[in-house]
Amino acid sequence: VPAQVVLTPYKPEPGYECQISQEYYDRKAQMCCAKCPPGQYVKHFCNKTSDTVCADCEASMYTQVWNQFRTCLSCSSSCTTDQVEIRACTKQQNRVCACEAGRYCALKTHSGSCRQCMRLSKCGPGFGVASSRAPNGNVLCKACAPGTFSDTTSSTDVCRPHRICSILAIPGNASTDAVCAPESPTLSAIPRTLYVSQPEPTRSQPLDQEPGPSQTPSILTSLGSTPIIEQSTKGG
């Protein structure tokens, strides 16, 4: 294409082509003619003396690219009750629907919208939600690794680390947390809370004496509510 700006329509010089992004070659007129911008369509094609005539898309119709379409495209139908509209239908873009929370897209359109949503699978006790999803977007369940558990049936809960017992009553397994025994009453000299670092992905929590209900997000282990009373000695 010549370096200088050329107004359409024009006859391309030998060896040159029309600018692909915003022009097209009209075989009948044998001219480079203007495409219509997003949000418009071709009302009249060009000829040797006059350029393309474009018009705005009507309601519920769109064109997303520079085009030479005779009609605008119809926007996808309204989102279903189990979907949310994440992009509205405008003259320049199609409507995009996504699945509501707790569902995944079982059937996608070529434009990235969702045609059919399905309820997410639930992982039962002993299984947690994996960090990665299945290719179709559904939840993947993985067996809780040693030292972790899940006691719920959920599409969001991951395996959580077992409560760490200074003194054990019942060990945890894949579907239940550990149960701690009461701490020795003789450990009551100078009280201090003993903080311990938990295995990934937990954060530092006080080591507990009695198991308490989990007050923490599911990625964290609940270590109960009562800290050990430790004699104030070096270490820990």
Partner: antibody
């Protein structure tokens, strides 16, 4: 609190033997308890433990050879069919990150 | 089961000196490691639990460190009373408790 093991004696190979662990000063029913043994001049060897729900957990080598049971006040270790290799001092201890309760042990000698 | 490998089997040091004992787990046990001291004719005595937490009444000359698979017990300012056999023990919650001990290290104080 104190732990005391008892029941250790000289037995002939193949003669079943049951050891007893008695704990004072704590509510034993709320503690998981383990058995550990030590052959003369050798190191400590973990056998297994029983939790408060009476579920038992054994080291791989100990499965089938030992049975751990409990009452509200005692914990027991049964050696099903002792061999000379089971000659050792047997200790009872609490289970957890902090295993601090240890008795003096009871000596089992297996000999013909 | 987890296998605990303890080195050295025996170590000799002078009064006032320092001794280092190493313990290696066959798989990661996070920080669930205890150290015990045992003297002839006595039961094991808990020194350190949770890899570095000193048990009540144990002198601060005893120091535990490490996590994962590599652990160390350091005894500084050695005293004659420290002559004993030291054991590491795994306390990892892998579904059920695993209680494997290391082979032991005899500490001789000159």
């Amino acid at each position: 609190q104190s732990v005391e093991e008892s029941g250790g004696r000289l037995v002939a190979p193949g003669t079943p033997l049951t050891l007893t662990c008695t704990v004072s000063g704590i509510d034993l029913s709320r503690y998981a308890m383990a058995w550990v043994r030590q052959a003369p001049g050798k190191g400590l060897e973990y056998i297994g433990y029983i939790d408060t729900g009476d579920s038992t957990y054994y080291a791989t080598w100990a499965k089938g050879r030992f049975t751990i049971s409990r009452t509200s006040t005692t914990v027991h270790l049964k050696i099903a069919s002792p061999t000379t290799e089971d000659t050792a001092t047997y200790f009872c201890t609490n289970v957890g990150v902090r295993m601090y309760l240890w008795g003096p042990g009871t000596l089992v000698t297996v000999s013909s | 089961d987890v296998v605990m490998t303890q080195t050295p089997a025996s170590v000799e040091a002078a009064v006032g000196g320092t001794v280092t004992i190493k313990c290696q787990a066959s798989q990661s046990i996070s920080s669930y490691l205890s150290w015990y001291q045992q003297k002839p004719g006595q039961p094991p005595k808990l020194l350190i639990y949770r890899a570095s937490t000193l048990e009540s009444g144990v002198p601060s000359r005893f120091k535990g460190s490490g996590s994962g698979t590599e652990f160390t017990l350091t005894i500084s300012d050695l005293e004659c009373a420290d002559a004993a056999t030291y054991y590491c023990q795994c306390g990892y919650y892998g579904g059920s408790y695993i209680g494997a001990f290391g082979g032991g290290t005899e500490v001789v104080v000159k």
